[in-house]
């Protein structure tokens, strides 16, 4: 009996036409929502003039349906037992699951004003930029609608640059009508223990963002893992959102709609400083903001974002060092609300429920030549928004899963 089940599982989790795994893999049967909370700055003038602590108040959720598009350009390579694809991006606003509309306004850091002097650390160019910032009446903070902030707006300061540069700015710009990938993953046909593991991303086995082994693309995309998952296993996965591979460890056993699943959680040491976790030394790529690599809980992903000063953290700076959160008032980190977890059905390795939580922050530094930033007395890692991307297996699918998989084992 057990041998038969194992054989069936091994057959059905292979990523090829006709298997259960393939059908769900091409287009997820799970409805995935991405909720956003925006950090509305309450004291913009005080910060710009006096370098005060930034007072923020989160507003949300604003909910979008995501990952509803099927994978495209799916190509099997029988030679190396891989399948390649791209994942199209799309987001549909869900008013009924949101506290307001996409036209709601927020006071947030001026992304272009903060980023420009970071990209151009040249005193002559900073004088030029200052001229354009003043002419466009831009300042350290700006008021933008949700739609503008997330998906893009024409920046008035960048629009004055007399060269053909991209003048559209947005936290996720460009998103709609773009694709993530190309991913090339093992289909598991020759070796089931490699199924869904990423062989290459964008044609490369490494990211070119990090030194040493930090640059490796490890594991799957977290939608599934090789079958027969044990509690002792560390689940490794790559997240293009955070430009790195990361891992989850067993946390607890959960009953999900009658299906026993293992909840794997991202441990605090994944975000630790090299002092606490020497394995993280290659994620510390600069010495100043990181206080000589002693700060923790924030990841500088600038190299992956064309040099823009983007930092990723957990929401409300959960598991971050006090020096990171000290200049910000109004944050309330909470393990339950702000941690990331994956609920994995251990026999198949399918992720049946997940919550991916992350926060997007922008570094803003004092800049003597830029009047909008010249009164700052310290750098700030400014929270812009945090997101909660969730998916849960539907009731119908859960019943089907119980009948076909867990029921048979019992």
């Amino acid at each position: 009996g057990d041998m038969l089940i194992e054989k069936t599982i091994k057959r059905e989790v292979v990523l090829e036409e006709g298997t259960t795994a393939f059908k769900n893999w091409v287009k997820t049967g799970t409805t995935v929502y991405r909720q956003f909370w925006i950090f509305d700055v309450q004291n913009p003038d005080d910060v710009a003039k006096n370098s005060s602590k930034i007072k923020v108040k989160q507003r949300g959720p604003y909910t979008y349906r995501v990952r509803y598009l099927a994978k495209e350009n799916i190509t099997q390579d029988p030679e190396d037992h891989t399948v390649s694809f791209v994942q199209p991006n799309g987001a549909i606003f869900e008013p009924s699951l949101s506290v307001g509309t996409e036209d709601d306004n927020f006071t947030v850091l001026n992304l272009a004003v903060a980023a420009a002097p970071h990209i151009y650390q040249n005193s002559f160019v900073q004088v030029v930029l200052n001229s354009l910032i003043k002419k466009s009446k831009s300042s350290m903070f700006q008021t933008r609608s949700l739609k503008e902030l997330l998906w893009g707006y024409k920046d008035p300061f960048l629009s004055l640059v007399p060269y053909p540069i991209s003048t559209t700015v947005g936290v996720f710009y460009p998103y709609n009508d773009t694709v993530d990938g190309v991913y090339k993953v093992f289909n598991g046909k020759d070796n089931i223990s490699k199924v869904a593991i990423i062989e290459s991303y964008k044609g490369k086995r490494n990211l070119s963002y990090w030194p040493s082994y930090c640059d490796m693309i490890n594991g799957t995309d977290a939608a599934s893992f090789p079958p027969f998952v044990e509690k002792s296993r560390t689940l490794r996965f790559f997240s293009s959102d955070i430009c790195r591979s990361i891992y989850a460890v067993f946390g607890s056993e959960i009953d999900l709609k009658g299906i026993p699943v293992y909840r794997f959680v991202l441990p605090a040491n994944a975000f630790a400083s090299p002092l606490q976790n020497p394995d993280n030394h290659c994620f510390c790529t600069e010495k100043v903001i990181s206080n000589n690599c002693t700060s923790y809980g924030v990841l500088d992903i600038g190299k992956c974002k064309e040099g823009k000063p983007v930092y990723i953290s957990l929401p409300h700076f959960l598991h971050a060092s006090p020096d990171v959160s000290e200049p910000i008032e109004g944050l309330h980190p909470n393990e339950d609300e702000h941690r990331t977890y994956l609920d994995v059905e251990p026999i198949t390795g399918f992720t049946l429920q997940f919550a991916k939580r992350l926060q997007v922050n922008i570094l803003v530094k004092p800049a003597r030549k830029i009047e909008a930033l010249k009164n700052l007395k310290r750098p700030y890692i400014v929270p812009i928004l945090w997101l909660n991307e969730t998916g849960t297996i539907g009731d119908e699918k859960a019943e089907m899963f119980k009948t076909q998989v867990t029921g048979k084992i019992k």
Partner: antibody, heavy 117, light 107 residues
Framework: EVQLVESGGGLVQPGGSLRLSCAAS????????IHWVRQAPGKGLEWVAW????????YYADSVKGRFTISADTSKNTAYLQMNSLRAEDTAVYYC??????????WGQGTLVTVSS | DIQMTQSPSSLSASVGDRVTITCRAS??????VAWYQQKPGKAPKLLIS???SLYSGVPSRFSGSGSGTDFTLTISSLQPEDFATYYC?????????FGQGTKVEIK
């Protein structure tokens, strides 16, 4: 086509004044800003003055500070260099040049200023 | 002020030669260095910006390299029209400053 044409050079006595003009076409001077660079006979290039984009700021080399004034008339798309209290060492070919990121991609043909008694 | 020191101040070379001119900045200017060519009685012409970015229309035999304080302009195979004076310039800080020039003459 981008073009810069200087005019206004000539012979002037020490202590005298002169106003150089730089007429631009093919681009808007206010978007880029304009620099003046000079070259004494048989010598190298020396940066003199700059009016930043949108005329918000002006900067000068120490050697001319307080004596020279750079300005622009956006309606005429023309930049000017007003030179007062001229000295013999100000004798040079004066070029106006376009720049945004600090390197000069277009130059005028130059106008000669001779300060001599 | 940032001093730009060019060497040599002059050199003699033949058509087809590989020519290298160096420029040293008195402090770190990252890659904010431009190179110009000037012929007698004419305005300078931009060859290279950002230390190594060839300006449009400039022949590919010209190349620039370097970062920080040491920079090089290379002409891979000298042509008759390349006999001129070459200047480096830092565009990192005000005042903008030039090297004293390198005159490339026919041997």
């Amino acid at each position: 086509e981008v073009q810069l044409v200087e005019s206004g050079g000539g012979l002037v006595q020490p202590g005298g004044s002169l106003r150089l003009s730089c007429a631009a076409s093919g681009f808007t001077i206010s978007s880029f800003g304009i620099h003046w660079v000079r070259q004494a006979p048989g010598k190298g290039l020396e940066w003199v003055a700059w009016i930043a984009p949108y005329g918000g700021y002006t900067y000068y080399a120490d050697s001319v500070k307080g004596r020279f004034t750079i300005s622009a008339d956006t309606s005429k798309n023309t930049a000017y260099l007003q030179m007062n209290s001229l000295r013999a060492e100000d004798t040079a070919v004066y070029y106006c040049a376009r720049s945004f990121f600090g390197y000069f991609d277009y130059w005028g043909q130059g106008t000669l200023v001779t300060v001599s008694s | 002020d940032i001093q730009m020191t060019q060497s040599p101040s002059s050199l003699s070379a033949s058509v087809g030669d590989r020519v290298t001119i160096t420029c040293r900045a008195s402090q770190d200017v990252s890659n904010w260095v431009a190179w110009y060519q000037q012929k007698p009685g004419k305005a300078p012409k931009l060859l290279i910006s950002y230390a190594n970015s060839l300006y449009s229309g400039v022949p590919s035999r010209f190349s620039g390299s370097g970062s920080g304080t040491d920079f090089t302009l290379t002409i891979s195979s000298l042509q008759p029209e390349d006999f001129a004076t070459y200047y480096c310039q830092q565009h990192s800080n005000l005042p903008l400053t030039f090297g004293q020039g390198t005159k490339v003459e026919i041997k």
